[in-house]
């Protein structure tokens, strides 16, 4: 007996071939001997089976002695043995229909779990193997679960169902809802405008939800909400914003925030959360602000940074085109009695400059000028 695997919702074509290459009488029946379809001369006739409106054939092949049974919009319950009667002989085909579905929405938040459920006909014993977009293989029986979804799990999952040495392949598109970056850091000189961007790692036609940016300033004892906003069909509208600082927010995606001035009291880290409509849980992105200030007070040239810096970052003061006068893994450095000229304050990581501020030291009789 020939075995054919089909997919729920798909179309399957069961073949039946006569030795004579011409149109002759044929009938397709199910295991209960109920006629599905056949022919009367060159006319297609249909029987009383429940497949009636979903069964068809190809008249174009009859003249070549081929009498296919086409079943459209397959259902699991179409799994059966189908019998083709032609030329006083019977051809039997066993059809097994499988379905594979994500038992939740296919749009899942980062960190959530994905469960794939296999629908199969009674008496079958299929095995399933799925390959994620990043090449990770998972195996299972009727259900397969993947916990802690990551951004790289977004894309097409290819699942192969094996039964009777035959296989059928399913493709399921999974979208992991997340920000492109889990964390970002912005380095700014005091007084500069600060731009925070929160690009999403997915695109959907309609995006609705609400969000908030909580900020923990380095100098503050507790965090505070800087801004709350709504998102409706990818349009952003601000609900509430603090007076200090007075953030501005872009009206379109990607989410974009502007801080008019980088000041030491704003240095710190924030957490932007986005709650999407019809989703449990929230998307998170951490954002950090490091602010640098270079000053000269009387005979003391000082460079300071505020905000979350790693211990391996180096803070240096140097006269232009000369060796660093002072270099420390600290958040403040200074030079006493600095000689006149253009001084540079540098924050660097393994030789790569992250932030620099220049200050001009004038001869002792005049006041310093900050460019």
């Amino acid at each position: 007996k020939k075995v054919v695997l089909g997919k729920k919702g798909d179309t399957v074509e069961l073949t039946c071939t006569a030795s004579q290459k011409k149109s002759i009488q044929f009938h397709w029946k199910n295991s209960n001997q109920i006629k599905i379809l056949g022919n009367q001369g060159s006319f297609l006739t249909k029987g009383p089976s429940k497949l009636n409106d979903r069964a068809d054939s190809r008249r174009s092949l009859w003249d070549q002695g081929n009498f296919p049974l086409i079943i459209k919009n397959l259902k699991i319950e179409d799994s059966d043995t189908y019998i083709c009667e032609v030329e006083d002989q019977k051809e039997e085909v066993q059809l097994l229909v499988f379905g594979l579905t994500a038992n939740s929405d296919t749009h899942l938040l980062q960190g959530q779990s994905l469960t794939l459920t296999l629908e199969s006909p009674p008496g079958s014993s299929p095995s399933v193997q799925c390959r994620s977009p990043r090449g990770k293989n998972i195996q299972g029986g009727k259900t397969l679960s993947v916990s802690q979804l990551e951004l790289q799990d977004s894309g097409t999952w290819t699942c192969t169902v094996l039964q009777n040495q035959k296989k059928v392949e399913f493709k399921i598109d999974i979208v992991v809802l997340a920000f492109q970056k889990a964390s970002s850091i912005v380095y700014k000189k005091e007084g500069e405008q600060v731009e925070f961007s929160f690009p999403l790692a997915f695109t959907v036609e309609k995006l609705t939800g609400s969000g908030e940016l909580w900020w923990q300033a380095e100098r503050a004892s507790s965090s505070k909400s800087w801004i709350t906003f709504d998102l409706k069909n990818k349009e952003v509208s601000v609900k509430r914003v603090t007076q200090d600082p007075k953030l501005q927010m872009g009206k379109k995606l990607p989410l974009h925030l502007t801080l008019p001035q980088a000041l030491p009291q704003y240095a710190g880290s924030g957490n932007l959360t986005l709650a999407l409509e019809a989703k449990t849980g929230k998307l998170h992105q951490e954002v950090n602000l490091v602010v640098m200030r270079a000053t000269q007070l009387q005979k003391n040239l000082t460079c300071e940074v505020w905000g979350p810096t790693s211990p391996k970052l180096m803070l240096s003061l140097k006269l232009e085109n000369k060796e660093a006068k002072v270099s420390k893994r600290e958040k403040a450095v200074w030079v006493l009695n600095p000689e006149a000229g253009m001084w540079q304050c540098l924050l660097s990581d393994s030789g790569q400059v992250l932030l620099e501020s220049n200050i001009k030291v004038l001869p002792t009789w005049s006041t310093p000028v900050q460019p």
Partner: antibody, heavy 118, light 107 residues
């Protein structure tokens, strides 16, 4: 998105060869028969070739039999038409079309223009 | 080969008119027939299959009838977007064949 996108058309001299491709997406390509249909400039539609879902059987119009070969690669969701010994009368927009079963075309590509001229 | 003959080859009509296009097969083809609509520079679009079954998403003003050798496509009330060329196609035997087309123009 359910779609078919043809490519590979262009200008070729009589007697030359060309291979057309049709990339399918958004549906179960392997379970559908596929067809090529052409349309000469300012003229009607002409069926060219068909291939069964499993790729075992193919069918051709008399005008292209022996010169054209239809094939499919289900792993790439792609349909092909290898056109050899091209004639000026093969000049047309070539469409790939999905078979609704039986032999009705419910999804078409935008077409690719093949010009056979010396 | 089965020849499909459409008539008329072109017609002029106004919005709101009832339009009938006929298709004749050179031999009996039972109900193995489809109708397509094609607009300039676009791919054809399936309207009706199995002679009278309306494809999903196609407006109900389109209808098909006939069996054997004579078939009809009717547009009950012509709309501006219906001005196009219409083709019939038989699925009775290979080679599959199309009618020559009927161009529906604005009067």
């Amino acid at each position: 998105e359910v779609q078919l996108v043809e490519s590979g058309g262009g200008l070729v001299k009589p007697g030359g060869s060309l291979r057309l491709s049709c990339a399918a997406s958004g549906f179960a390509f392997s379970s559908h028969w596929m067809h090529w249909v052409r349309q000469a400039p300012g003229k009607g539609l002409e069926w060219v070739s068909a291939i069964s879902g499993n790729g075992d059987n193919s069918y051709y119009a008399d005008s292209v039999k022996g010169r054209f070969t239809i094939s499919r690669d289900d792993s790439k969701n792609t349909l092909y038409l290898q056109m050899n010994s091209l004639k000026t009368e093969d000049t047309a927009v070539y469409y790939c079309a999905r078979d609704r079963a039986p032999e009705y075309f419910d999804l078409w590509g935008r077409g690719t223009l093949v010009t056979v001229s010396s | 080969d089965i020849q499909m003959t459409q008539s008329p080859s072109s017609l002029s009509a106004s919005v709101g008119d009832r339009v009938t296009i006929t298709c004749r097969a050179s031999q009996g083809i039972d109900s193995w027939l489809a109708w397509y609509q094609q607009k300039p520079g676009k791919a054809p679009k399936l309207l009706i299959y199995a002679a009278s079954t309306l494809e999903s998403g196609v407006p109900s003003r389109f209808s098909g009838s006939g069996s054997g050798t004579d078939f009809t496509l009717t547009i009950s009330s012509l709309q501006p977007e219906d001005f196009a060329t219409y083709y019939c196609q038989q699925a009775y035997s290979f080679p599959l064949t199309f009618g020559g087309g009927t161009k529906v123009e604005i009067k």
